[in-house]
């Protein structure tokens, strides 16, 4: 899925209201030091990519993450904000139910919910190109100039 | 807990650039954004520009654009801001900062401050 | 750039009593409901204090005498019963739109 289209105020709005305490909660107990971050993105829509992919793809040692609070919450503001995402997503999240049956939380786990934190702190405040700047990347959306 | 340690204060002559460090301890460096911020004697904040260590990405104020230069070294978890072509008026006390976790975009750990005394 | 007007510049108050600083924004910091304003505290020798994040939620740490309030362009910071360790200097930030911006500062002091 193209991330470009989807409106990313909302999508932050959402998680700082909502997706953020959720994963507080699904963290709670651990070391804000106890993993590095390690997964970087560049821009929002690459952002949410990686968040997509951390999120619901199970991985080695976390396969559970898809059925969380804020994986749910995640999936709808996508849906919602994002045109078309929706449709996209209909055969994954058939084969994640017939994947996983319960919510197991393992150290692996843990350490990937830390870097989704770090990709969406990232997602949330993008720094933006100036008027008359010359020494940014300019590989962002067209989101990406008015507003954090 | 996250702590950020300043570099001493410098006595500068105009002209001249000056070269301020910001190290980071306890947390993880590259996925904030760092900033920096500077007070003139007796007077209010001003934010001067930050840098996502992550990819060195930078946003400046556009006041200091042209003077400003803010880096990072991931490897050490330190940042730095380097200000040319000083002038009195640049005697300030400087500080970095920190964003908070969730991208409030607030600050939540500051430097001690750097003094930088720009003086003929 | 968004102007960040504070007033007033200097305020005495009572102790017990209540303060009250308003942080008025040239536009709105507001968006997608909503809104960037942030308030900090800072006394003399030391860096500013996180008091207020996003106009209305208290900063970790900070008594629960401090409240913020608003929305748009008009923002308040109220400090409910005036303690002698809030003598400091108050600002307002906002971060809704580049540059960040902070409002002139205002003196608190005891009457």
């Known amino acids: 899925y193209d991330f470009t289209n989807c409106d990313f105020e909302k999508i932050k709005a959402a998680y700082l209201s909502t997706i953020s305490k959720d994963l507080i909660t699904y963290m709670s107990g651990t070391k804000s030091t106890e993993f590095n971050n390690t997964v970087s993105c560049s821009n929002r829509p690459h952002c949410l990519t990686e968040i997509q992919s951390l999120t619901f793809n199970p991985t080695a040692g976390c396969a559970s993450l898809a059925k969380e609070m804020f994986a749910m919450k995640t999936k709808a503001a996508l849906a919602i904000w994002c045109p078309g995402y929706s449709e996209t997503q209909i055969n994954a999240t058939q084969a994640m139910k017939k994947a996983r049956k319960s919510k197991v939380t393992t150290n692996k786990c843990l350490e990937q919910v830390s870097q989704l934190q770090g990709l969406w702190r990232r997602f949330n405040r993008p720094l933006l190109k100036q008027q008359g700047s010359s020494d940014y990347k300019d590989d962002d959306d067209k989101h990406h100039h008015h507003h954090h | 807990e996250v702590q950020l340690v300043q570099s001493g204060a410098e006595v500068k002559k105009p002209g001249s650039s000056v070269k301020v460090s910001c190290k980071a301890s306890?947390?993880?460096?590259?996925?904030?954004?760092m900033h920096w911020v500077r007070q003139a004697p007796g007077q209010g904040l001003e934010w001067m520009g930050a840098i996502y260590p992550g990819n060195g990405e930078t946003s400046y104020n556009q006041k200091f654009k042209d003077r400003v230069t803010i880096t990072a070294d991931k490897s050490t978890s330190t940042a730095y801001m380097e200000l040319s072509s000083l002038r009195s008026e640049d005697t300030a006390v400087y500080y970095c900062a920190r964003e908070d976790d969730y991208g409030e975009g607030y600050f939540d750990v500051w430097g001690q401050g750097t003094t930088v005394t720009v003086s003929s | 750039d968004i102007v960040l007007t504070q007033s007033p510049d200097s305020l005495a108050v009572s102790l017990g009593e209540r303060a009250t600083i308003n942080c008025r924004a040239s536009e709105s910091v507001d968006n997608s409901g909503l809104s960037f304003m942030h308030w900090y505290q800072q006394k003399p020798g030391q860096p500013p204090k996180l008091l207020i994040y996003r106009a209305s939620n208290l900063g970790s740490g900070v008594p629960d005498r401090f409240s913020g309030s608003g929305s748009g362009t008009d923002f308040t910071l109220t400090i409910s019963s005036l303690q002698a360790e809030d003598v400091a200097v108050y600002y307002c930030q906002q971060i809704n739109t580049d540059p960040l911006t902070f409002g002139q500062g205002t003196k608190l002091e005891i009457k």
């Open positions: 306890g947390g993880t460096f590259s996925t904030y954004n």
